[in-house]
Structure formats: structure tokens, C-alpha cells
Interface confidence: low
């Protein structure tokens, strides 16, 4: 529908509260360094303007596009040049180039201070003093640190954040009530951000076709009773929603996501039997619930795939008539039969099938040529199965922390040029695959593990893209979205790497390590481990283990000492010397 005023249309559809929240998220995701107060001021100005357009859609400037209105507003920020440097040049451009320019300057790793959680009483006082400001601050802080966070989902997180404070600030033991809830929101939020980042990377780096293929596979696994026509409709609509959110069109995205949830619930009998509970919830919970809903049961009477896709004499005719539709049907039929496969594996199989048809449909005897195509799938299926089996065994043997350390060593040897903080962050997340997925039965392990690894490796890719230092990382990240994990798995030790100069300062520790949480202490030790491997890439597992065990003992000893600082200074020197000797540095 064409609306005289787009801003009035969205304000009416979304309501004032959601409108303001989404504009704040949009602005914070674009101008990540701007103070909270500045953003609130801009949002209030936009909201007041929107209200004038609701009152009279023909009023001045009400016919302008949202990009024009929001871009003009962002470009009024006085300190744009000083704070953002060349991003200020975006303001010299016209739409749509200006918005594209803002998008290109989104920073996945902004130089912002770590969010420190205040005391519970302090938070509760702030919450009671000004609930609205408190919740806006939450949206602002998350959005600026996660510039691709899925905006309608962030509204859902904010709703849960508010509920946690409403409940727990009245509880007898506020901390016992609130802190676990905040930890859960933080962990879920990081996971949600990373998953959405992969969707945006898929759309922006590999195009709409790649995203649609992913969506066909995932929705076909989730809704195996739905018809191909239905899955296609959902994929088209879902692609529009994510394209909008990834493009900064957050009002349209939230509006369209609500429409999609409404459609799914109105038509659940032709989509999935698992949607009933989701569809009884309020909008934000409903959309979240649908996105996470379990796979429906597979229809009992599904015929063999070979009949339509290998044995039929019409394969090449059907493929030639509508290539993407035919490949989409193949992907749909394969995925709905295989909830036990990862989405990326299903996409590899579809790619292999496509490559085979491209070759065989031009051959003298096409049927003879493609008759054995399904045999080519066997090694593709076995590779992730074997890898997951081996790594789950290793995880069960070592536990999460030591499994992470094994991955840290493995990945530092593969790509030692990558910055230490990035290697630590990515390897820690890769290591979490163990506790996340290895507990599942065989049938659920691969979709859990490989699709999670795709999300984590995308973090490596987007962080590396900001400051590229390794051709091997660039190659694995850019050649094929679905083969990223096999590409990284196949990397051996980088023989071209020149070991880093030894720097004693890197291995100097102080008494402040004793007051850190267990997680922070692990990160310190893992940072040291990466640095060790960078100094001595050929060090054996045994050598590294010996040094790390000594290091753990050293920290424990000095944290128990009366004069901790002296202990760290004196014992630290001995440890560095012993480590150098052990590693032959």
C-alpha cells in the first residue's frame, strides 16, 4: 500500500512506545559513540515530528522517506566529524547512498567500555526513580555494542529486562532473584546478536539467494508438513523482514515481522502442529516463540527422493524450466526428511546437486550422468558426523575450559596473525559447542553443532574484516558461506608464520587477577596461552600443558600469599624463566 506519509503509517502501526524504542535502537546502531542524552533528544524530536504527520499526513516533510528523515536528523549531530571521522562524509551524499554509507560504518567491535553491572540496590533505585529512562538506557547500551541486533527481538529482551526488575526489586533477596535473570538475558542476548549477525552477513556478503536457500532449508526442517508453496511464501516474507532489519529499516522490519507472525498463526493448520502455544502469546513473545519453535513431526508417508530428482526422465526439463524453483523443491524435500542434518550440510548437498545438473544436463546422456548423484552426498554427510564425534569425545574427556584451550591452540596455529583478543573470544565460543550440543542424542547433534559453529566462525569473519591480517581467514570467510567451517577445519599449521618476539611484559601478572571472577581469570590464562603459541607455534601439547599447569599453580599460590604483589613479581620472573626453558625460547 502506498501511504502519503511513511512515518505516520509506521507510527500508527507500531504505537508510540515501540516507535520510540525502535528509532532509539536505529540511531544507537548508527552513531555508536554518541552519548545517551543526545540520542534521546533526537528520538524525541523525530517522535514529535511523527505526531504532526499523524495529525496531518500532508504537512511539510511528512512525505519524505524514513531514510531521508532519519539521515537528516543524524546529520544534525554537531560533533559528527570529531567523533566519527570519515563517517561525517556520508552526510554529503543523497539517499540511498547516504544510508548505505552509514551502514558501511557500523562497527562490530566498537571501542566502548565494558558494561559493568552496578550493585543490585543501585540498579533497583535507578529503576524505581525513572523506569522509562532506565529501560531506554538498556536499549541504547545493547544497540550501540551490537549494531546488527535484531531490533524487534531487542524489544522482547527489554520487556523481559523490565519484568526482571519489576519482580526482583520487591523480593526479599533482590540479588538472588535478579542476578541469575540478568546473566540469562546477557548470555541469550549475545547468542541472539551473533545469530542475527550471520543472517545479515549472509544477505550482505552473499546475497538474497543465499539467505533464501538457508531459510528454505531451515523452515522445511521446522515445518515438514507444510507444502513447498507455503514454505516459499514464508521464506519470501522472512527474507523481506531480515533484509529490512539488516539494512537499518527497523520500523518496517518490526511491522512486517508482526504481520508475518499474524499470518503464521492464522494459517498454523497448514504450517505446523507445534505453533498453538506460541500463537496464544502477546506479540513480542509470539514472534520469539515462533522463531524458536521445535521441529514438527515428519509426515509418515514421504516417498523416496530419488523418484523425482534422479530416476525421473524429466529432471533436466524441470531444472531448465525454472532452475531456482526446482533446486528449492529439492532443498525443501531433502530438508524436511532430514532434521538430523545441519542447514549448512543441506546447502552443500543442494550445491552438489546443482553442480551435477549443470554438468549433466549438457551431456549426451544426462540420465546416465546424474544417476549416481546421491552417492556423492555420502562423504559430505560423513565429514561433519566424524568431526562432531571426535570433538564430543574430546570435550567429554577434557571438560569445557580445557576443551576451549585445545581449540585455542588449534586455531592459533592455523591463523596466528589474528589478534589475541579475537582468538580468545572466538575459541572460547567454539568451545561452548561441547556443553551446548554434545549432550544431545545423535539425531540432534549435527544441526546443533555445525549451525552453531557457523554463527561463531561468522564472528571471526566480521571481526577480521575490520582489520584483515590473514589471507587464510579472508579466503575461508569469502569463498563460500556454507563451506566456512570445513575450510577452517582443513587449515593446518601456518608454516609461513614468523614467531612473535618474546616479551616478558605479556607474561607479567599482578595481584588484581585474584579478585577477578572465575571467567575473567580463565580469559587471562587463555590470553597467555595464545601468546605462548604465537611465540612458539611448534610447541607440543605436552609442553604447553606443562607451562599452563605451572601458570595455574603460580596464580593460586600468589593469590593465597600475604604479600600478593611481591609474590607475583618474584614468582612471576621464575615462571617466565622456567617457561622459556621448557619451550626452548
Amino acid at each position: 500500500d502506498a501511504h502519503k506519509s511513511e512515518v505516520a503509517h509506521r507510527f500508527k502501526d507500531l504505537g508510540e512506545e515501540n516507535f520510540k524504542a525502535l528509532v532509539l535502537i536505529a540511531f544507537a546502531q548508527y552513531l555508536q559513540q554518541c552519548p545517551f542524552e543526545d540520542h534521546v533528544k533526537l528520538v524525541n524530536e523525530v517522535t514529535e515530528f511523527a505526531k504532526t504527520c499523524v495529525a496531518d499526513e500532508s504537512a511539510e516533510n511528512c512525505d519524505k522517506s524514513l531514510h531521508t528523515l532519519f539521515g537528516d536528523k543524524l546529520c544534525t549531530v554537531a560533533t559528527l566529524r570529531e567523533t566519527y571521522g570519515e563517517m561525517a562524509d556520508c552526510c554529503a551524499k543523497q539517499e540511498p547512498e547516504r544510508n548505505e554509507c552509514f551502514l558501511q560504518h557500523k562497527d562490530d567491535n566498537p571501542n566502548l567500555p565494558r558494561l559493568v553491572r552496578p550493585e543490585v540496590d543501585v540498579m533497583c533505585t535507578a529503576f524505581h526513580d525513572n523506569e522509562e529512562t532506565f529501560l531506554k538506557k538498556y536499549l541504547y547500551e545493547i544497540a550501540r555494542r551490537h549494531p546488527y541486533f535484531y531490533a524487534p527481538e531487542l524489544l522482547f529482551f527489554a520487556k523481559r529486562y523490565k519484568a526482571a526488575f519489576t519482580e526482583c526489586c520487591q523480593a526479599a533477596d533482590k540479588a538472588a532473584c535478579l542476578l541469575p535473570k540478568l546473566d540469562e538475558l546477557r548470555d541469550e542476548g549475545k547468542a541472539s546478536s551473533a545469530k542475527q549477525r550471520l543472517k545479515c552477513a549472509s544477505l550482505q556478503k552473499f546475497g538474497e539467494r543465499a539467505f533464501k536457500a538457508w531459510a528454505v532449508a531451515r523452515l522445511s526442517q521446522r515445518f515438514p508438513k507444510a507444502e513447498f508453496a507455503e514454505v516459499s511464501k514464508l521464506v519470501t516474507d522472512l527474507t523481506k523482514v531480515h533484509t529490512e532489519c539488516c539494512h537499518g529499516d527497523l520500523l518496517e522490519c518490526a511491522d512486517d515481522r508482526a504481520d508475518l507472525a499474524k499470518y503464521i498463526c492464522e494459517n498454523q493448520d497448514s504450517i505446523s502442529s507445534k505453533l498453538k502455544e506460541c500463537c496464544e502469546k502477546p506479540l513480542l513473545e509470539k514472534s520469539h516463540c515462533i522463531a524458536e519453535v521445535e521441529n514438527d513431526e515428519m509426515p509418515a508417508d514421504l516417498p523416496s527422493l530419488a523418484a523425482d530428482f534422479v530416476e525421473s526422465k524429466d529432471v533436466c526439463k524441470n531444472y531448465a524450466e525454472a532452475k531456482d524453483v526446482f533446486l528449492g523443491m529439492f532443498l525443501y524435500e531433502y530438508a524436511r526428511r532430514h532434521p538430523d542434518y545441519s542447514v549448512v550440510l543441506l546447502l552443500r548437498l543442494a550445491k552438489t546437486y546443482e553442480t551435477t545438473l549443470e554438468k549433466c544436463c549438457a551431456a549426451a546422456d544426462p540420465h546416465e550422468c546424474y544417476a549416481k548423484v546421491f552417492d556423492e552426498f555420502k562423504p559430505l554427510v560423513e565429514e561433519p558426523q566424524n568431526l562432531i564425534k571426535q570433538n564430543c569425545e574430546l570435550f567429554e574427556q577434557l571438560g569445557e575450559y580445557k576443551f576451549q584451550n585445545a581449540l585455542l591452540v588449534r586455531y592459533t596455529k592455523k591463523v596466528p596473525q589474528v589478534s589475541t583478543p579475537t582468538l580468545v573470544e572466538v575459541s572460547r565460543n567454539l568451545g561452548k559447542v561441547g556443553s551446548k550440543c554434545c549432550k544431545h542424542p545423535e539425531a540432534k547433534r549435527m544441526p546443533c553443532a555445525e549451525d552453531y559453529l557457523s554463527v561463531v566462525l561468522n564472528q571471526l569473519c566480521v571481526l577480521h574484516e575490520k582489520t584483515p591480517v590473514s589471507d587464510r581467514v579472508t579466503k575461508c570467510c569469502t569463498e563460500s558461506l556454507v563451506n566456512r567451517r570445513p575450510c577452517f577445519s582443513a587449515l593446518e599449521v601456518d608454516e609461513t608464520y614468523v614467531p612473535k618476539e618474546f616479551n616478558a611484559e605479556t607474561f607479567t601478572f599482578h595481584a588484581d587477577i585474584c579478585t577477578l571472577s572465575e571467567k575473567e581469570r580463565q580469559i587471562k590464562k587463555q590470553t597467555a596461552l595464545v601468546e605462548l603459541v604465537k611465540h612458539k607455534p611448534k610447541a607440543t601439547k605436552e609442553q604447553l600443558k606443562a607451562v599452563m599447569d605451572d601458570f595455574a599453580a603460580f596464580v593460586e599460590k600468589c593469590c593465597k600469599a600475604d604479600d600478593k604483589e611481591t609474590c607475583f613479581a618474584e614468582e612471576g620472573k621464575k615462571l617466565v624463566a622456567a617457561s622459556q626453558a621448557a619451550l626452548g625460547l
Epitope: A226, E227, F228, A229, E230, K233, E266, N267, D269, S270
Partner: nanobody, 122 residues
Framework: EVQLLESGGGLVKPGGSLRLSCAAS????????MNWVRQAPGKGLEWVSS????????YYADSVKGRFTISRDNAKNSLYLQMNSLRAEDTAVYYC???????????????WGQGTMVTVSS
């Protein structure tokens, strides 16, 4: 050329039956959700029934449930509407229409027939 052609309409007494046919050309009906839609004299369009591409999902408007039956013959590339226990309020022009992508209660159609008139009167 992609087109739909309805037939089978006519004058029938209340309580009587009719069978409408819709022949498709230029595409296969089994690849799409197919629909019957009607327009009573002086009224707007009213969706009547739909059958999904596999025939697994069949829907009816509440006003015709239990009286009308939608079906399809893939070999003849045709759609049918069996109408029993007809009432005066069923009087309308009946159109068959192709839904390009949706299953379930339809929202939009890309191909329409020219319609066939059904009159229920004593």
C-alpha cells in the same frame, strides 16, 4: 497463454446440486493452490474454497462448509466445485483463481477465469 475457463453454471432450484468445472491451460494446476471465489449481485467478492498444490490442505468458507466440495483432476488439468443443498444466497458469479504462492485462507490471486453464473431460485 496462461488462462482459466469456468463452465457448469446455470439455474437450479433450492436444495438442488451443480458441478462447476475450471479448465487450466499454460500451467499445471497441481503446482498451485487453486481457489473458487464468488460475487453475488451487487456485492463484493467472497472467497469460497481452496485446495493446496498437493491436495492435502482444503479449506471452505463457513457459509458453504458441509455443502460444497472442491477437487482437482491432475490428468485433465482441471479444478471442480461440487455444490449440493444449494440456497438462494448461493446465487453469484463463480470464478476460479490461481494463488501464486499461498496456502490457507487466500490473500491474492494472479490468474482469474471469466466466471460462470449460478442462479438458485424456485
Amino acid at each position: 497463454e496462461v488462462q482459466l475457463l469456468e463452465s457448469g453454471g446455470g439455474l437450479v432450484k433450492p436444495g438442488g446440486s451443480l458441478r462447476l468445472s475450471c479448465a487450466a491451460s499454460g500451467f499445471t494446476v497441481s503446482s498451485y493452490t487453486m481457489n473458487w471465489v464468488r460475487q453475488a449481485p451487487g456485492k463484493g467478492l467472497e472467497w469460497v474454497s481452496s485446495i493446496s498444490s498437493s491436495g492435502r490442505y482444503i479449506y471452505y468458507a463457513d457459509s458453504v462448509k458441509g455443502r460444497f466440495t472442491i477437487s482437482r483432476d491432475n490428468a485433465k488439468n482441471s479444478l471442480y466445485l461440487q455444490m449440493n443443498s444449494l440456497r438462494a444466497e448461493d446465487t453469484a458469479v463463480y470464478y476460479c483463481a490461481r494463488d501464486p504462492r499461498m496456502v490457507g485462507n487466500p490473500h491474492e490471486f494472479d490468474i482469474w477465469g471469466q466466471g460462470t453464473m449460478v442462479t438458485v431460485s424456485s
